[in-house]
């Protein structure tokens, strides 16, 4: 059958029918339904929601909907022995204690099973000592403390403000600095936008609000006890001492009312510069310890959380492809939340639900996609991307042979200013073309395309007239698909104006105040931004699953490879004498990029000209496109990070949320001037250039004519 026979309706009509079926009112209704009670991973409530979604996806018309369960390591506070932090006097008496819970928002006072704020996977402990304020606890913050200010964090409890980087990186940095405990807090400078009221009167964080979150350093491993393999019924589990990525020191999060009480007494060194000052009325002294009058007082942490192997449930829905059922386009987002999940994840889950409903409607009318679409509701994302990673580990052989693309669907909104897209360069043209066909929901852009408002509000720093598209990092469920398996991936959501709102994420992130009302009252009352995100995510899935030739442009990879090579060479050029001394050359990498550019260009010409009615040739060309992302995978992985295998992109070693290009070379060059053995260090740079050059060349050759 030709594609059009199989799919029963002309392609253009299909896409329009699919998009027209998406309704803002339905997304609103689904969001409400998903946010009335907490859905913490590993709880009965989240299992019940999984079964509800399974049932509804079946009703919507999917061919099959199954639950996939795994038994993974999760972490919970002790219900009878709460976590808190004290200031103790010289006699050991607790003269101040941090709060044990967030004041519940109006209308939710009688909801049970609201997990109190905690840092998931913190070990138990009751360390006491002097406090050191470490700003955001970034690598550069510890460099400033240790190298410039000569402040030793060894044996100290450090207090760090949330923001800028993933909290797990903060904890890792504190551990490496010798700290014996970490207090994380939300500073109003980062989580309170000027001119906006606190929840429930606005979308700002109140003083009693606290950000929950895991503090793992998994580096893509999934379940800490079964790295590389699914946590199934017959799994061999590591002992807790050998578990991947667990922190070794107690960690606990607090709000800014409690932080004020700890920071106002700080003595020792003054902050090194204004970038270390937040918005509290405190001096932001670095310490160590409290100022004169309070110098005999110490800080004590009381952490009693436990790690427990717990069952989790993914929901996997299948819509079988009519022509290429063995080619998979995946739309996935998580279902588990810290509390109500008003934004994270249910604003995304509601969009996925509506996308499934629309596809189901088309299917009931006799349509099928060309390729198979898989829909996933992941569990335990908040505990380290566990559900998605375990499923991908279980199905890795199928995915690496059949996976066309993965589209992520966590929070649909983190603001209501403009679109934000992170994706593989293969999808740039798909995103551009799709957004040109969609209407902008933005005020002042009535009758204009989404592409136009997006480009105006978020212009590309390199190419005029084009929007910014960012690199994929991590911190979400695309990680295993992209960074480990090399499946082309992308994500889209509505975001804030980063230029005027410099707070990190959105203020109520991972707090009890992330409710349905937060979205309905303050972010998107008409659900028009949610609808737009549904159109972008759904439209991408539709095109990827239905276009005869895969909508990937390999020439865009060539452009970014040249840019990334130029960037990494520029970093290396800061050490020109060492490059000369150790004969460090990037010529092999630039040569490989040049070859890639030429071969990609020739491939694109052939793609225009080949006989698309010949199914064998069509499949051959599509396979070359599908496997291009796979060709950037190094089976040996990155140094000390075996599950990060993509040579072009990896999560930054200093911030899991951020993507780094040519990460192997980047990490080898990082802080190279401080290495004790420069010859060895520069040898590793040369080795990483070799790996990168080889990989780019090998990827290029997959696009060459096959014979």
């Amino acid at each position: 059958k030709s594609s059009n026979e199989a799919t029963n309706i002309t392609p253009k009509h299909n896409m329009k029918a699919f998009l027209d079926e998406l309704k803002a009112e339905n997304i609103k209704k689904f969001l409400y339904n998903f946010t009335q009670i907490p859905h913490l991973a590993g709880t009965e409530q989240n299992f019940q929601l999984a079964k509800q979604i399974q049932s509804q996806w079946k009703e919507f018309g999917l061919d099959s909907v199954e639950l996939a369960h795994y038994d993974v390591l999760l972490s919970y506070p002790n219900k009878t022995h709460p976590n808190y932090i004290s200031i103790i006097n010289e006699d050991g008496n607790e003269i101040f204690n941090t709060s044990l819970f967030e004041p519940p928002p109006p209308g939710y006072e009688n909801v049970s099973d609201i997990v109190p704020p905690f840092s998931a996977f913190s070990p138990q402990g009751m360390p006491e000592g002097d406090l050191v304020y470490v700003n955001y606890a970034r690598t550069e913050d510890f460099f400033k403390l240790e190298r410039d200010m000569k402040i030793n964090c060894s044996g100290k409890i450090v207090i760090a403000r949330y923001g800028k980087v993933f909290r797990g990186n903060k904890v890792k940095n504190a551990q490496l600095a010798g700290a014996k405990g970490v207090i994380l807090y939300s500073d109003p400078a980062d989580y309170f936008a000027p001119g906006v009221k606190s929840y429930p009167d606005g979308w700002n964080l109140p003083g009693g609000g606290v950000q929950r979150g895991n503090i793992l350093n998994l580096n893509g491993a999934g379940d800490p006890l079964t790295p590389g393999y699914p946590a199934n019924e017959y799994a061999y589990r590591r002992g807790i001492a050998e578990a991947v990525g667990l922190p070794s020191i107690p960690v606990h999060p607090i709000g800014y009312y409690d932080a004020q009480k700890l920071l106002e007494k700080m003595g020792g060194s003054a902050p090194p510069d204004s970038s270390w000052r937040g918005s509290l009325k405190v001096p932001y002294n670095v310490g160590p310890g409290f100022t004169g009058n309070f110098s005999t007082q110490k800080v004590k942490m009381h952490i009693h959380s436990t790690n427990e192997v717990t069952r989790i449930y993914n929901v996997i829905g299948t819509l079988r492809g009519a022509v290429e059922p063995d080619r998979y386009v995946i739309l996935g987002g998580h279902r588990d939340s810290w509390v109500f999940g008003g934004i994270d994840p249910q604003s995304g889950a509601a969009v996925v639900h509506e996308i499934v409903r629309s596809f189901g409607t088309l299917k009931k009318e006799g349509w099928r996609p060309r390729r198979t679409i898989l829909f996933a509701s992941w569990d335990a994302e908040e505990f380290g991307l566990l559900g998605s990673t375990e499923w991908a580990e279980e199905n890795s052989r199928l995915l690496q042979e059949r996976g066309v693309a993965y589209i992520n669907a966590d929070s649909s909104i983190e603001g209501n200013y403009t679109l934000r897209v992170d994706c593989t360069p293969l999808m740039y043209s798909l995103v551009h073309n799709l957004t040109k066909e969609l209407k902008s929901p933005d005020e002042g852009f009535e009758g204009k395309s989404l592409y136009e408002s997006w480009t105006k509000k978020s212009p590309s720093p390199e190419f005029s007239g084009m929007p910014r598209i960012s690199k994929l990092g991590s911190g979400n469920d695309f990680e295993v698909f992209f960074q480990r398996l090399g499946i082309a991936s992308g994500r889209a959501r509505y975001t804030k104006n980063w230029e005027t709102n410099k707070f990190s994420g959105y203020p109520l992130y991972h707090s009890v105040y992330e409710t349905y009302e937060l979205v309905e009252k303050f972010y998107d009352p008409m659900f028009k931004y949610h609808l737009t995100v549904a159109q972008v995510r759904g439209g991408m899935v539709f095109e990827l699953a239905n276009s005869i030739v895969l909508p990937f442009d390999c020439r865009d990879y060539a452009v970014v490879l040249r840019k990334y090579a130029d960037k990494i060479y520029s970093i290396s050029m800061k050490h020109p004498q060492e490059m000369k001394t150790y004969s460090v050359s990037f010529d092999s990498l630039f040569s490989a990029v040049k070859n890639f550019t030429e071969i990609a260009s020739k491939f694109s010409e052939r793609l225009q000209d080949f006989d698309k009615s010949n199914p064998i040739v069509l499949r051959m060309m599509n396979d070359q496109l599908m496997f291009l992302e796979r060709a950037f995978i190094d089976p040996l992985g990155l140094p000390d990070r075996p599950f990060y295998r993509h040579v072009i992109y990896a999560p930054s070693s200093h911030n899991k949320y951020a993507g780094e290009s040519f990460p192997g070379i980047y990490d080898a060059l990082f802080d190279i001037e401080s290495k004790v053995d420069p010859s060895k260090a520069w040898g590793e740079v040369k080795r990483q250039i070799y790996v990168a050059a080889f990989t780019v060349q090998a990827a290029a050759e997959t696009l060459s004519e096959v014979a």
């Epitope: 720093p461 390199e462 130029d566 960037k567 060479y569 520029s570 050029m573 020109p576 050359s585 990037f586 010529d587 630039f590 040569s591 040049k594």
Partner: nanobody, 118 residues
Framework: EVQLVESGGGVVQPGRSLRLSCAAS????????MHWVRQAPGKGLEWVAT????????EYVDSVKGRFTVSRDNAKNTLYLQMDSLRAEDTATYYC???????????WGLGTLVTVSS
Amino acid sequence: EVQLVESGGGVVQPGRSLRLSCAASGFTFSSYAMHWVRQAPGKGLEWVATIYQDGSESEYVDSVKGRFTVSRDNAKNTLYLQMDSLRAEDTATYYCVGRGSTSITPVWGLGTLVTVSS
């Protein structure tokens, strides 16, 4: 032929200014980062500054921050280094370095000597 030619060097007193130029030919200048590197007499090579593609982003070695400014005129295929408040320790041969749009090897100019002396 891909070529970089520096000019503008000379002898100058401490505290005064100089502006170095680097004219590029034979490649698409606007597309890529450009660098200034210097070598003081009897010393090794030292990176001074980098300016990225469109000229909006630049970086400097700590010792010249606030005194040197790198810029580029993509229309004229020229790179500049404005050096203010010069010090004796800025005495060096200054090289511009770049990579053409299709060149595999980096291109170095022949250098221009700057001597800061009273």
